[in-house]
């Protein structure tokens, strides 16, 4: 049983407006519109949001007023479909408007673009930012919600409100300081990094819902919640997992008002039932709504009960294993996942789900045999290779990260992944490698028992994005193979890929490796991307180049940039030394 109220309301829009309050209501409607129609300007969306809010207020005043009984999808969809020049700007998305609800809303959802062709969200310089923030904080935050939501159409809406609130607090504090720039930059960079991670994690949840349904998501939630709340009983974990599944399903389905409302309800429930959930919730529960829900979502693991019996007792040694499994498969497997997960906060959720899958497959096979206990008696020992594989991955990669640093580690991953899938576009490979490489900074500095869950669950989320981008234009059989399996098998599948032997190397094009003096003035991040683009292209030209050969070329390239960017006449340096560099590269890779 979930915790959510289910009374019917005469007017859904009035109900949500009352529950959420005007500020959150408007923010969520803006996010919804920005995620559906990603090319519209802030002003266009702000106008629609105001119209929807005014209408909601009339329904609050009189729930029987005209159209107040309409569903939110009908109201929002009618607004979106009334936008002028929809076909010119959005092409076939306009066909959604010929459909009836609920097909129309689901048509909009299917047209969300994970990689919209929008320019990167550039942060204005501090002084300008503070001026516009002081002039109109509401409009300023509206722009933030709009710009993030349209670039991340599956961003978890209530969490985006939280990040906007963080943004607001940072600006309020830093804009009062003498040195605004040095106050703002590190703080806003921190929020940006966290928000980007939040985005890929949520996208993975929606992918799970889209491809495998709430059954798969609920299994993920049971494992995750059991790790965090090892003292809660199975019934409590199941209730929380059911509610968390509902909240996420609503957000992934574009039902953002319901999602935010139900998330607040779930946070309230958790805070009212701390005794049966966890001893670590009080600090979170003392915070206001958005901070409270965010805090609960990443609360530290409760202390594990000291007297937990060995997992084998109920799931291997018990004589009734096959009987219990046959009677209620999902419940029995659920209790296995719960019991195993609460004992292993040091494992990734992906690993726990792989173990549960292995256990299920073993029971399916063994319970049909003449002597089941003899057959499934070794199942826990058979988990060992499944556990060792990600542990080795973490050790190898963290050692490499410690040796090379973040940029060098990204380059090592870029070479590896370009060899695995050389047909993938260079910008996608560079983006993926840069994101995968951040795992070092994010996870390798953590205590030993936190590394594995951090590394593997983060890598899985990044690889999900690789799969989504590849789905749009499939070019690599390697990638297709790994992306078409189950979500939990993706990371091991990608890790196991080797050099693609079917690939015909790209011919060497001098212009790919020709650079100009404008590179010298680029910010460090952009310089890195240019160099990594060249590295990926080198590997595409010579997929079997040795690490040593690539290092020679990249060192030479770095030296060339350094020399020419320090030269008095940069343009001449680039035009004379550039061709020499290209020749040396060709020779080094010959």
């Amino acid at each position: 049983r979930g915790v959510f109220r289910r009374e019917a309301h005469k007017s859904e829009i009035a109900h949500r407006y009352n529950d959420l309050g005007e500020q959150h209501f408007k923010g969520l409607v803006l996010i919804a519109f920005s995620q559906y129609l990603q090319k519209c300007s802030y002003d266009e969306h702000a106008k629609l949001v105001q119209e929807v809010t005014d209408f909601a207020k009339t329904c609050v005043a009189d729930e029987s007023a005209a159209n107040c009984d309409k569903s939110l999808h009908t109201l929002f969809g009618d607004k979106l479909c009334a936008i002028p020049n929809l076909r010119e700007n959005y092409g076939e998305l306009a066909d959604c408007c010929t459909k009836q609800e609920p097909e129309r809303n689901e048509c909009f959802l299917q047209h969300k673009d994970d990689n919209p062709s929008l320019p990167p969200f550039e942060r204005p310089e501090a002084e300008a930012m503070c001026t516009s923030f002081k002039e109109n904080p509401t409009t300023f935050m509206g722009h933030y919600l709009h710009e993030v939501a349209r670039r991340h159409p599956y961003f978890y809406a209530p969490e985006l409100l939280y990040y906007a609130e963080q943004y607001n607090e940072i600006l309020t504090q830093c804009c009062a300081e003498a040195d605004k720039e040095s106050c703002l930059t590190p703080k806003l960079d921190g929020v940006k990094e966290k928000a980007l991670v939040s985005s890929v994690r949520q996208r993975m949840k929606c992918s799970s819902m889209q491809k495998f349904g709430e059954r798969a998501f609920k299994a993920w939630a049971v494992a995750r919640l059991s790790q965090t709340f090892p003292n809660a009983d199975f019934a409590e974990i199941t209730k929380l997992a059911t509610d968390l599944t509902k909240v996420n399903k609503e957000c992934c389905h574009g039902d953002l008002l319901e999602c935010a409302d139900d998330r607040a309800e779930l946070a309230k429930y958790m805070c009212e039932n701390q005794a049966t959930i966890s001893s670590k919730l009080q600090t979170c529960c003392d915070k206001p709504l958005l901070k409270k829900a965010h805090c609960l979502s990443e609360v530290e693991h409760d202390t594990m009960p000291a007297d937990l019996p060995a997992i084998a007792a109920d799931f291997v040694e018990d004589q009734e294993v096959c009987k219990n499994y046959a009677e209620a498969k999902d419940v029995f497997l659920g209790t296995f996942l719960y019991e195993y997960s609460r004992r292993h906060p040091d494992y990734s959720v992906s690993l726990l789900l792989r173990l549960a899958k292995k256990y299920e497959a073993t029971l399916e096979k063994c319970c049909a045999e003449a002597n089941p206990p003899a057959c499934y008696g070794t199942v826990l020992a058979e988990f060992q290779p499944l556990v060792e594989e990600p542990k080795n991955l973490v050790k190898t990669n963290c050692d490499l990260y410690e040796k090379l640093g973040e940029y060098g580690f990204q380059n090592a991953i870029l070479v590896r992944y370009t060899q695995k899938a050389p047909q993938v576009s260079t910008p996608t490979l560079v983006e993926a490698a840069r994101n995968l490489g951040r795992v070092g900074t994010k996870c390798c500095t953590l205590p030993e028992d936190q590394r594995l869950p951090c590394v593997e669950d983060y890598l899985s989320a990044i690889l999900n994005r690789v799969c989504l981008l590849h789905e749009k234009t499939p070019v690599s059989e390697h990638v297709t193979k790994c992306c078409s399996g189950s979500l939990v098998e993706r990371r091991p599948c990608f890790s196991a890929l080797t050099v693609d032997e079917t690939y015909v190397p790209k011919e060497f094009k001098a212009e790919t490796f020709t650079f100009h003096s404008d590179i010298c003035t680029l910010p460090e991040k952009e310089k890195q991307i240019k160099k990594q683009t060249a590295l990926a292209e080198l590997v595409k030209h010579k997929p079997k180049a040795t690490a040593e050969q690539l290092k020679t070329v990249m060192d030479d390239f770095a030296q060339f940039l350094d020399t020419c960017c320090k030269a008095a006449d940069k343009d001449t340096c680039f035009s004379t030394e550039g061709p020499n560099l290209v020749t040396r590269c060709k020779d080094a890779l010959a």
Partner: nanobody, 125 residues
């Protein structure tokens, strides 16, 4: 495998009613949602209504709202579609479908794993 058997179709006059039934049977039956779709020759299969197994949440195509009612009997693994005030444009083959994992989209036929053979509904004017 899951088997779905529909019944209750037939020929009726505009304004009349019909009740379609669909019974699901088979090994390890996991139902998250059951729905009804319909198809007219030469056209795509169209979502009509669906009901979630746990909460009993329902969704209807706008043009059938207020006329059609979907309900379930979880003890019998059955779903029903009560169709009132039928119109000639409701004429189609009606298919029952099961989603066994609770996928995100209600109206996409790819969200459903198992399908019945279909039952013909004809509404004459």
């Amino acid at each position: 495998e899951v088997q779905l058997v529909e019944s209750g179709g037939g020929l009726v006059q505009a304004g009349d009613s019909l009740r379609l039934s669909c019974a699901a049977s088979g090994r390890s039956l996991g139902i998250y949602r059951m729905g009804w779709f319909r198809q007219v020759p030469g056209k795509e299969r169209e979502f009509v209504a669906a009901i979630s197994w746990s909460g009993g949440t329902t969704r209807y195509l706008d043009s059938v709202k207020g006329r059609f009612t979907i309900s379930r009997d979880s003890t019998k693994n059955a779903v029903y579609l009560q169709m009132n005030s039928l119109k000639p444009e409701d004429t189609a083959v009606y298919y029952c479908a099961v989603d066994s994992s609770g996928r995100l989209y209600w109206t996409l036929s790819t969200s459903y794993d198992y399908w019945g053979q279909g039952t013909q509904v004809t509404v004459s004017s």
